[in-house]
């Protein structure tokens, strides 16, 4: 039996200068080429070594790219999705979609999951957090007294 | 993890033919960019030619262009490699490689760096 897998989705502005061998990483995806099911989105699969994306260190494999220079990356072919990074310029701005797998209860496969969930440990930190200053306050009102 | 078998070398005359095949495994084919590279003894490992994920787009290097013709068969999670007009300088083993994605830089098809995954290499000699 598997536990369910969470993401905690978080979205990033990342500015890379195209290097003497360009922007140096790989993309799959596009409506012709789903490579997650049901998300006909852009996503990277290899980053490479000594590369731009690699020596800034933000983008990761896995990320989502959701535009390119303001551009939307939605319904597009992967040739074209393609040929919009080639023609990007020196200067690229991409908005990107960073997803943190955050797996509950028995360890199971990597599956697609529920991008929507909330991580367990979001709602127990912050609980955990006010439960140590209530008793912090606590004995400070009783030395008080 | 990708696997790579490469298959079909053999001894072969000069003007003669060979088709070589490479078989992945491991990963969804589809989404895999393939290559061949080859070696000759005491010589660096050269590209020879590319194919994209759905085999719309090839390039060759010019050594072996209007002789060579890469393809691929995703059904069968398989790439090739006809090879006509041998010649004994074609002589060389020959390697398949693997990268998951397009690159979104022009030109990267012909560097071994950007490939992840390799098999072991099959003979070709043509003598």
């Known amino acids: 039996m598997n536990g369910r897998v969470d993401y905690l989705v978080t979205e990033e502005e990342i500015n890379l200068t195209r290097g003497p061998s360009g922007l140096g990483f790989n993309i799959v995806g596009g409506t012709d080429q789903q490579y997650v099911s049901n998300d006909s989105g852009i996503y990277v699969s290899r980053i490479k070594e000594n590369g731009a994306a690699a020596l800034d260190g933000r983008l990761q494999e896995g990320d989502k790219i959701l535009s390119v220079n303001g551009q939307d990356l939605k319904n597009l072919l992967h040739q074209d999705a393609v040929d919009l990074f080639r023609n990007a310029g020196y200067a690229v701005s991409l908005r990107v979609q960073h997803r943190l797998q955050v797996q509950n209860g028995p360890i199971g496969h990597r599956g697609e999951g529920d991008p929507s969930g909330i991580p367990i440990f979001m709602v127990l930190v912050p609980v955990f957090a006010l439960t140590m200053v209530a008793a912090w306050a606590f004995m400070r009102y009783r030395q008080q007294l | 993890h990708v696997q790579l078998v490469e298959s079909g070398g053999r001894l072969v005359q000069a003007g003669g033919s060979l088709r070589l095949s490479c078989a992945a495994s491991?990963?969804?084919?589809?989404?895999?960019?393939m290559g061949w590279f080859r070696q000759a003894p005491g010589k660096e490992r050269e590209f020879t030619a590319h194919?994209?994920?759905?085999?719309?787009?090839?390039n060759y290097a010019d050594s072996v262009k209007g002789r060579f013709t890469i393809s691929r068969d995703n059904a069968k999670n398989t790439v090739y490699l006809q090879m006509n007009s041998l010649k004994p300088e074609d002589t060389a083993v020959y390697y398949c490689?693997?990268?998951?994605?397009?690159?979104?830089?022009?030109?990267?098809?012909?560097?071994?760096?950007?490939?992840?995954?390799w098999g072991q290499g099959t003979q070709v000699t043509v003598s």
């Open positions: 490689a693997a990268t998951l994605g397009d690159s979104v830089d022009l030109d990267s098809d012909a560097d071994p760096r950007g490939y992840d995954y």
């Open positions: 491991g990963r969804t084919f589809t989404h895999l960019n």
């Open positions: 194919i994209n994920w759905s085999g719309g787009s090839t």
